[in-house]
């Protein structure tokens, strides 16, 4: 999955009069990240995590930039001709992505009363619109307004593409990646194998993404590959994964063995439980 930054900017009109407020919701890698109105931006969650993202900076720049965008969108809404009585909304959704091969994509989408009527690929500058006559009318309306000052518009949308990517890179550089990662629950069990030996099994479950390192160590040193048996990494039905690794050891030497787990940059070690044998079964065929 690419890293992404998604801005959802909403302005409102009531009985044809454009309201002064606006709301921007920002998602980083698909997770709620920042919510801004015309007065301030607020991170989600606040606290230690937000401090990690920002360092010693504040959200002042974001607030200033998004306030400017809010004004632009209010002007756009004011130029939509078919405003009827009651409440109406204009949304601009802007998305930029950085893919694993470092290629980038940016797009912009306009919605009126929740209905998509105009999209632009911000790299190719290509516009697309749905086939409905209402969407076509709205799209022509907005495009004509945006073309009124063609140079400003061109500069504005180039800047939007560049700024979005620059912001995304800045947030990612902070080391706070919101891409979904769920650490595993790790559970070690022991079972009787044969006289004087026990099989110890280390199970990791509920983790995402699927890449994981799970292995047995003796006195802190990894056991050779052929003395361990691995289960496949399998989906568990909850959008996460599970796997296991087992090895056979001499009874009485349990305290020398630990299960080592590494996942998404985090690692942990898990001892063999002491005491009676818990499960009377063998993983070895």
């Amino acid at each position: 999955e690419p890293h992404s930054l998604r801005y959802n900017l909403t302005v409102l009109s009531w009985d044809g009069s454009v309201q002064s407020g606006f709301l921007t919701e920002v998602h980083l890698d698909g997770q709620p990240f920042l919510r801004c109105d015309r007065q301030k931006c607020r991170a989600k969650p606040q606290g230690q995590w937000a401090e990690d993202v920002l360092g010693n900076k504040t959200w002042d720049r974001e607030t200033r930039d998004l306030t400017g965008n809010g004004k632009d969108l209010r002007m756009t809404l004011a130029h939509i001709k078919d405003q009827k009585e009651g409440l109406h909304s204009l949304q601009e959704i802007r998305v930029c992505e950085i893919h694993e091969d470092n290629s980038t994509r940016s797009s912009q989408h306009f919605y009126y009363d929740g209905e998509l009527f105009l999209s632009q690929n911000l790299e190719t500058k290509e516009w697309t619109m749905p086939q409905s006559s209402r969407a076509q009318t709205l799209a022509m309306n907005v495009r004509n307004f945006l073309k009124e000052d063609a140079m400003k518009t061109k500069t504005h949308y180039h800047a939007m593409h560049a700024d979005c990517l620059q912001e995304l890179r800045r947030y990612l550089k902070s080391g706070v990646v919101l891409r979904r990662t769920v650490p595993p629950m790790v559970n070690v069990t022991r079972s009787e194998a044969s006289e004087g030996n026990i099989t110890v099994t280390c199970r990791a479950s509920g983790f995402y993404p699927w890449n994981i390192t799970l292995s047995w160590r003796q006195d802190g040193v990894s056991l050779s590959h052929d003395t361990q048996q691995w289960g496949d990494v399998l989906p568990d039905g909850n959008g996460t994964y599970q796997t296991w690794v087992a090895t056979r050891i001499c009874q009485g030497e349990e305290q020398r063995f630990t299960c080592y787990m590494e996942h998404s940059g985090n690692h942990s070690t898990h001892p063999v439980p002491s005491g009676k044998v818990l499960v009377l079964q063998s993983h070895w065929q």
Epitope: V176, V177, T181, G206
Partner: antibody, heavy 124, light 107 residues
């Protein structure tokens, strides 16, 4: 559905450590859209937020300044629970302690699921 | 810390009455406010989030409004099960803070 089950002693001696555990079912302590909180309630202080733990690519904690020097909230992914430790307690820490989840709503930091509460008395 | 004050601190009402509680914040908190109901010996229960959004499963007789520093919580027609204490809570800034509560009892 999501449930929180609290456990821990109801009586703690002054200067000792208050320890409570909150077991989660129906959700994961390492969900990266939730935060796991401790809140207490007493007649003198009302409802008082103490702190939280949450996972966003790594583990974070936020604590109320009033208890920051004495509090630790730890997640335990192997048992899917989280714990509260409050050191050097005084009778002023006598309260009903609640664990609570925050995170069902995309933007609102609302405590939508609560534990049953544990009355903790600090007395010798 | 952001202070929240509630008024009244208690009120007596009858079944069917319209009940209004206000919550005042010590600074602008936009719409970052929730309302809870608590019955004796029980944990608080979320009723309203983001100042005006009804939590799933909560009856529509409960409503909330306001933004900035002034907020209102309303029960349009009080039912026997609504006699309880109601709290507002802000999440604009850490630490999360709660109002002192408003106790609604039977007249």
């Amino acid at each position: 559905q999501v449930q929180l089950q609290q456990s821990g002693p109801g009586l703690v001696k002054p200067s000792q450590t208050l320890s409570l555990t909150c077991a989660i079912s129906g959700d994961s302590v390492s969900s990266n859209s939730a935060a796991w909180n401790w809140i207490r309630q007493s007649p003198s202080r009302g409802l008082e937020w103490l702190g939280r733990t949450y996972y966003r690519s790594k583990w974070y904690n936020d604590y109320a300044v009033s208890v920051k020097s004495r509090i630790t909230i730890n997640p335990d992914t192997s048992t899917n629970q989280f714990s509260l430790q409050l050191n050097s307690v005084t009778p002023d820490d006598t309260a009903v302690y609640y664990c609570a989840r925050e995170g069902a709503h995309e933007w609102a930091d609302a405590f939508d699921i609560w534990g049953q509460g544990t009355m903790v008395t600090v007395s010798s | 810390d952001i202070q929240l004050t509630q008024s009244p601190s208690s009120l007596s009402a009858s079944v069917g009455d319209r009940v209004t509680i206000t919550c005042q914040a010590s600074q602008d908190i936009s719409n970052y406010l929730n309302w809870y109901q608590q019955k004796p010996g029980k944990a608080p229960k979320l009723l309203i989030y983001d100042a005006s959004n009804l939590e799933t499963g909560v009856p529509p007789r409960f409503s909330g409004s306001g933004s900035g520093t002034a907020f209102t919580f309303t029960i349009s027609s009080l039912q026997p099960e609504d006699f309880a204490t109601y709290y507002c809570q802000q999440y604009d800034n850490l630490p999360h803070t709660f109002g002192p509560g408003t106790k609604v009892d039977i007249k």
